[in-house]
């Protein structure tokens, strides 16, 4: 998602015109401008592909288009966490990878994308109505989720290119603060720019070196990668029936290494209650005193270590957990 704004070039004031005050007034817009330019909306893309070699095998690939550091990725099926999903894999940059059959191989592809192979044979293939969801928890953006599936008519070996799916949910707790500050900053910046516009030159002029005013642009991947990513999202085509109830809003994900000690009653959801949340179904980041954070949902009182806030500087594969285990 890219937003562009025409912003006239800011020229430093001529010496002596406003002195120190002038400098100070223009440092702030520069800082704010930088913040505005770098503060784009993150996105999650999901790609589901049926393997041509093994017709009952699926590969799910997900990526996060955002500038924050990823602290956790959860892949589930049946719908977004908290709305009918059971966790298939959870990937943590430091603590490794957890996966549940029929997930066969979950791995980090890059620091911001993962892939998961799902196996099945005949009856154990995922269903036609199965949606796969990827949820990325990142700092400071919060938690973002997108879902995808394979088109019913898809040929084996083919897939829709990855796409940011429409089901995107940001964790308010994680982003409201940052967004609020940035929004305020951007508004303030515009206000300053307008004030400068109505003042005599040479406060603000078009850049002499560029025929066109430079563009401030919110964070986005390169246009090439964006083009590759923006396509309709996909779903799975297999041989089992849809759920008989529409009221299913099962679960979130597993309690990771542990969860926050909360004192909620036993949660009503099932198979994947790690990221399960009370309604509204948003994962909510909770900061913990010791600098760790975990996902708190409606769950039994758990205690234990939380999630490490910062991923391993060596990157996601620095430690892939006990996954010599399969």
């Amino acid at each position: 998602m890219r937003t562009e704004a025409q912003v006239p070039a800011l020229q430093p004031p001529e010496p002596g015109l406003e002195g120190a005050m002038g400098h100070r007034t223009l440092v702030l817009p520069w800082v704010l401008l930088t913040l505005c330019v770098t503060a784009g909306t993150p996105e999650v893309w999901v790609q589901v592909r049926m393997e041509a070699t093994e017709l009952s095998s699926f590969t799910i690939r997900c990526g996060f288009l955002g500038s924050g550091s990823i602290s956790l990725v959860t892949v589930s099926w049946g719908g977004p966490n908290g709305a009918g999903g059971t966790t298939l894999a959870v990937l943590h940059p430091e603590r490794g990878i957890r996966q549940w059959a029929p997930a066969r191989q979950a791995r980090w592809e890059t620091q911001s994308s993962i892939s998961l192979i799902l196996e099945g044979s005949g009856a154990s293939s995922p269903c036609a109505n199965t949606t796969f969801c990827c949820k990325f928890a990142s700092f400071p953006e919060g938690s973002w989720e997108a879902c995808g599936s394979l088109p019913p008519s898809s040929d084996p070996g083919l897939s829709a290119p990855p796409t940011p799916a429409p089901i995107l949910r940001a964790d308010l707790a994680g982003i409201l603060g940052v967004s609020g500050v940035l929004l305020f900053g951007c508004v303030y910046l515009l206000h300053l720019l307008r004030r400068h516009k109505h003042r005599p030159a040479p406060r603000l002029q078009p850049s002499r070196t560029s025929p066109q005013a430079p563009r401030a642009r919110a964070w986005a991947p390169s246009q090439a990668s964006q083009a590759a990513l923006h396509v309709p999202y996909a779903t799975i085509n297999t041989s089992c029936r849809p759920a008989t109830l529409d009221t299913a809003h099962p679960h979130g994900g597993p309690s990771w290494w542990a969860s926050l000690p909360t004192h909620a009653a036993h949660r009503p959801q099932g198979p994947a209650a790690w990221a399960s949340t009370p309604i509204p179904a948003r994962g909510s980041f909770v900061s913990v005193e010791n600098g760790l954070y975990a996902q708190a949902g409606e769950r039994p009182p758990h205690t234990g270590p939380g999630l490490t806030l910062f991923p391993d500087p060596r990157g996601p594969r620095a430690m892939e957990g006990p996954l010599g285990v399969r």
Partner: antibody, heavy 118, light 107 residues
Framework: EVQLQQSGPELVKPGASVKISCKAS????????IHWLRQSRGKSLEWIGY????????GYNQKFKSKATLTADNSFSTAYMEFRSLTSEDSAVYFC???????????WGQGTSLTVSS | DIQLTQSPASLSVSVGETVTITCRVS??????LVWYHQRQGKSPQLLVY???NLADGVPSRFSGSGSGTQFSLKINSLQSEDFGSYHC?????????FGGGTKLEIK
């Protein structure tokens, strides 16, 4: 109250198949994975696999993938395990259990005793 | 697959005594370990989840400790209903595996 009620004991011949049922009550069936485990006499518990009733998709322990078929019938809130090509090694007590959030099994069936004998 | 080694395999103790059962895991599973109690001819009952959390309705004389690869279950002041088998199980990834079990008998 959450309850898992399993079908009765089975005595079958080697090479035959058996289908054991596990009827759930007291909670929304489609919301929880139902797992199947077995315990041979004097041995530890072994995990066979699970079925996710919401979409009917199972996940298997590779050891049992060619031996077991796990299904669910949401209209009857019942999970099934079919075990085929039975040998005396398959004589055991088979349990179904409800999984809570990839964290633990909080409710178990009473067990179904399977005896494979000629 | 992750291996769980439970010790001791059997234990003969008297009512009122304190016992500790250990479970060693072949890989770091953080706190993803569960303990069950099983009476003869019955199904297992959840005691402890997440390594240290007591399940609903479980008496406080039971306690779980440990994380990573080493876990233990402690039972203070054993009661007659505590006899039977104890199993540890990891919940890290599938395939889920169990320890060999510890049989607790009355002395």
């Amino acid at each position: 109250e959450v309850q898992l009620q399993q079908s009765g004991p089975e005595l079958v011949k080697p090479g035959a198949s058996v289908k054991i049922s596990c009827k759930a009550s007291g909670y929304p069936f489609i919301n929880y994975n139902i797992h199947w485990l077995r315990q041979s006499r004097g041995k530890s518990l072994e995990w066979i696999g699970y079925v996710y009733p919401y979409n009917g998709v199972p996940g298997y322990n590779q050891k049992f993938k060619s031996k077991a078929t796990l299904t669910a019938d949401n209209s009857f809130s019942t999970a099934y395990m079919e075990f085929r090509s039975l040998t005396s090694e398959d004589s055991a007590v088979y349990f179904c259990a409800r999984e809570r959030g990839r964290d633990y099994f909080d409710s178990w069936g009473q067990g179904t005793s399977l005896t494979v004998s000629s | 697959d992750i291996q769980l080694t439970q010790s001791p395999a059997s234990l003969s103790v008297s009512v009122g005594e304190t016992v500790t059962i250990t479970c060693r895991v072949s890989a770091n599973i953080y706190s993803n370990l569960v303990w069950y109690h099983q009476r003869q001819g019955k199904s297992p009952q959840l005691l402890v989840y997440g390594g240290t959390n007591l399940a609903d309705g479980v008496p406080s004389r039971f306690s779980g400790s440990g994380s990573g690869t080493q876990f233990s279950l402690k039972i203070n002041s054993l009661q007659s209903e505590d006899f039977g088998s104890y199993h540890c199980q990891h919940f890290w990834s599938t395939p889920y595996t169990f320890g060999g079990g510890t049989k607790l008998e009355i002395k």
